[in-house]
């Protein structure tokens, strides 16, 4: 009988973003979830294979926080915080789940502002990331995944194009922030985004809580 | 209103040719890739072509590589299947089929290919 | 062999709840759509993204993801519902359509 289970995408470390991989082993023991364990700074992490000790794989686990103070920056100016994770290597749909588990969704562009401020960030890198824009519900057209109203464009010459295959939106820096439309399925570097909530808890991924358990009727739980 | 129409069936021998069109209404053809998608009798939908809108870039499941071709005529609104070297496995209702957002939310009503001797 | 697997076949009684899932590695990086193909009839699709419905699809037909799985919940099954049900995915650049092997659901 198993649980349900949600891949937990990791941020930094050494796998690209790939998820967690439960249960792992490190140092002779075997972790059902996020660990401290072997880390003075107390940050949560896991192995993304199963021994640790042979792959030496691993990434820090994303938490839901009130604040923006480790893996993120700060905009003093708006509150808005921005997570860059340029050695992922994540779908759009994958991005977007690594974003929500963290509190947070992808990147929305809403002002002219805010733009001036990304390119600050994206400066010195060479870089295309996956962004919140998407037209997947077609009903809708383009719109921001955190549900933003699409009222500032950035959009390079020509774009978007190709309707029938590429319905996710990147942001360039080739192009200095200019955005494209790329199919939605392929590998990339992606930008989170939150405003911190002054009342919500820090709460680690514990995707096994308050699971309903479904295992065959000769089963227990 | 989308419309997209199959031609072309019909019943061939072993190692015969046939060449399948789809005629597309209602959407702006020229910006849209086109698939054509099989069934085989009492079988689950196979996936055989796509071609991107400007025809600049095609690929095909690996059973009818080197004999079947996907091609396009945008001044037509068209899109082709032309299929030689037919076997008895690829009998099929084939369907013309235009993706949406990571989805073929359009479909032909499909036409009947039967390879037999 | 399909590169999203499906159980080939579920019943449920009219009026029940059926819920059909389809499992492979390309739903971990796409969403999931569902088509409805009847005898005799091309596919329609029937529910797409996380969880739309497309005009016309009554709200009986739900999605669903968690990791490499998909469900398509069917709530208060119909006569017309009975029908075979294939799941789809963008795959790869050299097979960009993957789909599941379908499922037949009869209701009783």
């Known amino acids: 009988c198993a649980l349900p289970y949600h891949e937990v995408y990791t941020i930094q470390g050494n796998s690209h973003g790939k998820p967690c991989t439960i249960p792992f082993k490190y140092d002779n023991q075997w972790f059902h979830g996020c660990t401290s364990t072997g880390r003075e700074d107390g940050h949560l992490w896991c192995a993304t294979t199963q021994d640790y000790g042979k792959d030496e794989r691993w990434g820090f686990c994303p938490i839901k926080s009130n604040d923006c103070e480790t893996f993120w920056d700060k905009d003093q100016l708006t509150d808005s915080c921005y997570q860059f994770n340029f050695q992922s290597t994540l779908s759009w749909r994958e991005a977007w789940a690594s974003c929500e588990q963290q509190g947070a969704d992808l990147l929305s562009i809403t002002e002219i502002h805010e733009q001036t401020y990304i390119n600050g960030l994206l400066t010195g890198y060479s870089s295309t990331l996956w962004i919140g824009l998407n037209d997947l519900d077609t009903s809708g057209g383009w719109q921001w995944s955190d549900n933003s109203p699409l009222k500032y464009l950035n959009w390079e010459s020509d774009q978007p194009d190709n309707p029938s295959e590429e319905n996710c939106g990147v942001i360039r820096t080739e192009s200095s922030g200019g955005w494209q439309n790329r199919d939605c399925s392929i590998a990339l570097p992606y930008v989170c985004k939150k405003k911190p909530n002054a009342t919500a808890e820090p709460t680690p991924p514990d995707r096994w809580a308050n699971v309903k358990v479904e295992c065959e009727p000769s089963w227990q739980p | 209103e989308v419309q997209l129409v199959e031609s072309g069936g019909g019943l061939v021998k072993p190692g015969g040719s046939l060449r399948l069109s789809c005629a597309a209404s209602?959407?702006?053809?020229?910006?849209?890739?086109m698939n054509w998608v099989r069934q085989a009798p009492g079988k689950g939908l196979e996936w055989v072509a796509n071609i991107k809108p400007d025809g600049s870039e095609r690929h095909s499941v690996d059973s009818v590589k080197g004999r079947f071709t996907i091609s396009r005529d945008n001044s037509k609104n068209s899109l082709y299947l032309q299929m030689n070297s037919l076997r008895a496995e690829d009998t099929a209702v084939y369907y013309c089929?235009?993706?949406?957002?990571?989805?073929?939310?359009?479909w032909g009503q499909g036409t009947l290919v039967t390879v037999s001797s | 062999s399909s590169e999203l697997t499906q159980d080939p076949a579920v019943s449920v009684a009219l009026g029940q709840t059926v819920r059909i899932t389809c499992q492979g590695d390309?739903?971990?990086?796409?969403?999931a759509s569902w088509y409805q193909q009847k005898p005799g009839q091309a596919p329609v699709l029937v529910v797409y993204?996380?969880?739309n419905r497309p005009s016309g699809i009554p709200d009986r037909f739900s999605g669903s993801s968690s990791g490499n799985t998909a469900s398509l919940t069917i709530t208060g099954a119909q006569a017309e519902d009975e029908a075979d049900y294939y799941c789809?995915?963008?795959?790869?650049?050299?097979?960009?359509?993957?789909f599941g092997g379908g499922t037949k659901v009869t209701v009783l």
């Open positions: 209602g959407f702006t053809f020229s910006s849209y890739s």
């Open positions: 390309s739903l971990r990086r796409s969403y």
């Open positions: 993204f996380k969880n």
């Open positions: 089929a235009r993706p949406g957002a990571g989805r073929l939310d359009y």
């Open positions: 789809n995915s963008r795959g790869t650049s050299r097979n960009p359509w993957a």
